[in-house]
Interface confidence: low
Amino acid sequence: QPSVSPGEPSPPSIHPGKSDLIVRVGDEIRLLCTDPGFVKWTFEILDETNENKQNEWITEKAEATNTGKYTCTNKHGLSNSIYVFVRDPAKLFLVDRSLYGKEDNDTLVRCPLTDPEVTNYSLKGCQGKPLPKDLRFIPDPKAGIMIKSVKRAYHRLCLHCSVDQEGKSVLSEKFILKVRPAFKAVPVVSVSKASYLLREGEEFTVTCTIKDVSSSVYSTWKRENSQTKLQEKYNSWHHGDFNYERQATLTISSARVNDSGVFMCYANNTFGSANVTTTLEVVDKGFINIFPMINTTVFVNDGENVDLIVEYEAFPKPEHQQWIYMNRTFTDKWEDYPKSENESNIRYVSELHLTRLKGTEGGTYTFLVSNSDVNAAIAFNVYVNTKPEILTYDRLVNGMLQCVAAGFPEPTIDWYFCPGTEQRCSASVLPVDVQTLNSSGPPFGKLVVQSSIDSSAFKHNGTVECKAYNDVGKTSAYFNFAFKGNNKEQIHPHTLFTP
């Protein structure tokens, strides 16, 4: 028994005065606790605890289950213990089969012995299988067998406690080790969408997915720069033993403009933390913004192609799109598509493909788009560049030569006189009158120019050339003159195209 200094309270004394006592099954256990301030006896084995307020603990017929630690406590809280083994050849182990181990920690296989004198107290795999090579253990007859540094790979390991009794191996009931994983990385978090655009009154719902090795991962939705607790709902799944998934769904049933902001899904475990954010923008009503991808004034050569392209932002989604020319709607020749396949996309592209444009097809081409909230439109002014065409070339009764040409841009008319039979008309003649006439065609059509010269100035046989030209090309008409006596005779005019 421990020695104490005089005057200090001393622990109780127990008879028999030894730390361990071995009795046979069926024998009597008689333990006496001597102390003037005796309070109680306590018996402990595995999860079981019994108390006795008598100072003498008597068990008339000992059973294996009476094996355990008997502790006598006095009123000073001081105690003394004796460990009793009740040897029962038919029950060598006391067993608590629940066996949980935290990864990288030690765990106790609770199979204390009822006979400390058996040998080779150890662990064995079930059905004769070997234990994992790296599994280390320390046996303790009073407590069980401590597995050192549990590995994740031991999960569901089936094992027995084992002893040798009279040269034979005796196994306990089987234990199944359940390993609780340690956190060795931060949680993996992801969000259903990185940004949300809503109208006032619409429901905002966003889901954060948290993945980790076990369900003890912590997660929450937070609003940046706010301490307000957000309402969230959870769903969770175990995809196998060390693969846990939680979905945390945040909902605002009727979003307001002032709900706009950044929301963070935060998760942490004992290793560290991770977060992901989503942005909410709430607008009071929908919108459409159109951005032309080319200049809205377009010049194109006759017979060439042009693509009228717009990008536009539309929220909510666009419902009607159309291209219009001269109050007519195009049914083909155009396509409309989202700028990206992203679920959050609000940007779209519309293209009108105009092919082999004629001079008569200039004008205003309008793109119209609408959604449930607003309409929007943009106009393109298309000018078709055409080489001049000489509409009329006549000798008027007043002796004037007149040439009328049409084209775009506005043609210039020059006059030349070729004396005799010369093919090249180089001497230029100044016109008497030049007028730009109003075209009867649609706006953006060809421009008509009329130019006149006085034929009385020509005194010799020859040819007069009316040449109309612009940036696209040129066209000429010719007047042939021959003098008979004093009379001037106009031979039929003709045109030649000079590229």
Epitope: R97, K174, H239, G240
Partner: antibody, heavy 119, light 107 residues
Framework: EVQLLESGGGLVQPGGSLRLSCAAS????????MSWVRQAPGKGLEWVST????????YYADSVKGRFTISRDNSKNTLYLQMNSLRAEDTAVYYC????????????WGQGTLVTVSS | DIQMTQSPSSLSASVGDRVTITCRAS??????LNWYQQKPGKAPKLLIY???TLQSGVPSRFSGSGSGTDFTLTISSLQPEDFATYYC?????????FGGGTKVEIK
């Protein structure tokens, strides 16, 4: 989508052998313990065998121990049950099932394959 | 092996009734107790795991309780699609065992 599809059942004479297969899709077999459960005509469910996710640990009902062998081919994502020395009392629909983890029950089951042992 | 005993083995009930099925284990299985529903010609379906946790997608009229050796499955208001056989199963031991089943029939 998780799916389990058993095959290999049929009529066999007492003492004969059969190998049942369970093709898994929609998940990785190595992450889950897998079990075979059988149901004799008009009777209840009887557990037959379990194999751990790693394939390192196998467990059998006393009634089939020594005769049946559970295995898995992770490259084919397939579970097997080799049944030898078959008896009339082994006649049943055999289901393969996935353990949802940490013994939280068998969360996905195949449609079953019928094994009839009769002379 | 751990024996699982279900009672009653069959019962007749009407739509809207509250139905209770009990399952008793021959030794403590803590909360390692699962419930399944099986309809004729079909594979069993997991309803409840860990004695009281509803499997995803299972209606909330199903509930489970208990720990140790005594467990209960309750259907708060029986629906036409609930007529089936129900099994309990312990997964505490590596040797899984099922109860004998309870057949719920239309009265």
């Amino acid at each position: 989508e998780v799916q389990l599809l058993e095959s290999g059942g049929g009529l066999v004479q007492p003492g004969g052998s059969l190998r049942l297969s369970c093709a898994a899709s929609g998940f990785t077999l190595t992450s889950y313990a897998m079990s075979w459960v059988r149901q004799a005509p008009g009777k209840g469910l009887e557990w037959v065998s379990t194999i751990s996710g790693s394939g390192g640990y196998t467990y059998y009902a006393d009634s089939v121990k020594g005769r049946f062998t559970i295995s898995r081919d992770n490259s084919k994502n397939t579970l097997y049950l080799q049944m030898n020395s078959l008896r009339a009392e082994d006649t049943a629909v055999y289901y393969c099932a996935r353990d949802s983890g940490y013994d939280r029950g068998l969360d996905y089951w195949g449609q079953g394959t019928l094994v009839t042992v009769s002379s | 092996d751990i024996q699982m005993t279900q009672s009653p083995s069959s019962l007749s009930a009407s739509v809207g009734d509250r139905v209770t099925i009990t399952c008793r284990a021959s030794q403590s299985v803590r909360t390692y107790l699962n419930w399944y529903q099986q309809k004729p010609g079909k594979a069993p379906k997991l309803l409840i795991y860990d004695a009281s946790t509803l499997q995803s997608g299972v209606p909330s009229r199903f509930s489970g309780s208990g720990s140790g050796t005594d467990f209960t499955l309750t259907i708060s208001s029986l629906q036409p699609e609930d007529f089936a056989t129900y099994y309990c199963q312990q997964s505490y031991s590596s040797s899984i065992t099922f109860g004998g089943g309870t057949k719920v029939e239309i009265k």
